[in-house]
């Protein structure tokens, strides 16, 4: 807390300019008028004053604004905002997109801080939708964004926002989750060949039905296993032994290694074991040789 | 994190010349604003000059004329070129950086200037 003191002689700002920056603390509290500079905050980003000075600067506001800032500050905070607190920002009304952008823009290149995580959370309550504007923008700036958001939020994803997404990015969705994004990145990669659309269309996978899965297997693709454990279980099911081999390629002898873990678990007790046999890799528990395989679930549509 | 280590400050006489440096080391490419402060013998600590990462630059009015800033980004290394130094320039000079991923200065240990006949 900065010691107030009379403002010297001559050293009132009458407006919000870099000869401030020279100021010491208490010279800034004791001369720089709460309401100019809340009227002038657009010109405090332009000056590079030093976190000490922000915190002085910052402690003005909050004495002018104890109910929270209006958005025309809130909009002009640039490096300010760095240093509110999630409680800081709980008390904010943000609507525009503009303000959300420019101070998305501060933290731009960085992990996601709780202070951005509640500036959202405040800015998604306030416009009451999650609209395609701000995903776009959202998306833009955090493409992890993604998978905290619910199955009925991410419907409302563009596919275009899709190409912004990193693998790691949905290293945390579920596959709930995944099985909403994955028919809009099949979309958004449809113009792609073959190879590249692989690479694109890989982390995804986690939302791919079987019929996907099957025409990838005719595309030489060599999934590695990686990629074919985060697979739905029943979208990996119906897949034959050969449709398993085309699609992993080389990869295939890493199943092994798996087959005590779903879905490779499951899928081997779907399988012949004369089929499993020509793999080559000693994989046990597929149906005995001369066993009839009944469809229960097609038995109880019939009755 | 942000280390900075400075050096080249030492006892001069009145007239005289020196240039200071200060060495930046850890997450350099955060780095946003480089600033020199200084301390004088019972007083506070002032603000000397500054530069920016896009170049721009200013020194106090006291030192305007005299002290010059300046930054190779390459090394990481801030200078400052002080000439026709007087006995009140005698303290001693910080550097310290503001960074754009954590709202906190950084600072180095400071160097000792002594401007003495």
């Known amino acids: 807390e900065v010691e107030k003191t009379a403002c010297p002689s001559g050293k009132k700002a009458r407006e919000i300019d870099e000869s401030l920056i020279f100021y010491k603390k208490w010279e800034l509290e004791a001369c720089v008028d709460a309401a100019l500079l809340a009227t002038q905050m657009d010109r405090v980003n332009a000056i590079p004053f030093t976190y000490e000075q922000l915190d002085v600067l910052k402690h003005k506001l909050d004495e002018l604004y104890p109910q929270g800032y209006p958005e025309s500050v809130i909009q002009h905070l640039g490096y300010l905002f760095l240093k509110m607190s999630p409680e800081d920002i709980r008390k904010w009304n943000v609507t525009s997109l503009e303000t959300l952008k420019a101070l998305l823009e501060v933290n731009k290149g960085h992990e996601m801080s709780p202070q951005v995580a509640t500036l959202i959370d405040r800015f998604v309550k306030g416009r009451g939708q999650l609209d395609k504007d701000t995903l776009d923008t959202l998306t833009a700036f955090y493409p992890g964004y993604l998978c905290s958001l619910s199955p009925e939020e991410l419907s409302s994803v563009p596919p275009s926002s899709i190409w912004a997404v990193r693998p790691q990015d949905l290293d945390t969705c579920d596959p709930r989750q995944l099985d909403v994004l994955y028919p809009k990145a099949r979309l958004a990669f449809q113009n792609m060949n073959g190879s590249e659309y692989f690479v694109k269309i890989q982390s995804f996978l986690g939302g791919a039905p079987t019929e996907d899965l099957k025409a990838l297997s005719q595309q030489n693709v060599s999934m590695d296993l990686a990629t074919f454990m985060k697979l739905r279980t029943d979208a990996v099911l119906p897949l034959t032994v050969a449709e398993v081999q085309k699609l992993l390629g080389p990869h295939v002898e890493g199943l092994k290694a798996e087959e005590r873990h779903r879905p490779v678990r499951d899928w081997i007790l779907r399988q012949r074991q004369d089929d499993l046999d020509t793999l080559g890799l000693g994989l046990q528990g597929g149906i005995p040789n001369g066993y009839l395989v009944l469809d229960l679930s097609m038995q109880e549509a019939l009755s | 994190e942000v280390q900075l280590v400075e050096s080249g400050g030492g006892l001069v006489q009145p007239g005289g010349s020196l240039r200071l440096s200060c060495a930046a080391s850890?997450?350099?490419?955060?780095?946003?604003?480089m600033y020199w402060h200084r301390q004088a013998p019972g007083k506070e600590r002032e603000l000397v000059a500054y530069v920016t990462s896009r170049g721009t630059s200013n020194v106090a009015d006291s030192v305007k004329g005299r002290f010059t800033i300046s930054r190779d980004n390459s090394k990481n290394t801030l200078y400052l070129q002080m000439n026709s130094l007087r006995a009140e320039d005698t303290a001693v000079y910080y550097c310290?950086?503001?960074?754009?991923?954590?709202?906190?200065?950084?600072w180095g240990q400071g160097t000792l200037v002594t401007v003495s006949s």
């Open positions: 850890g997450r350099t490419s955060t780095i946003d604003t």
């Open positions: 310290s950086v503001r960074t754009t991923s954590y709202p906190v200065d950084f």
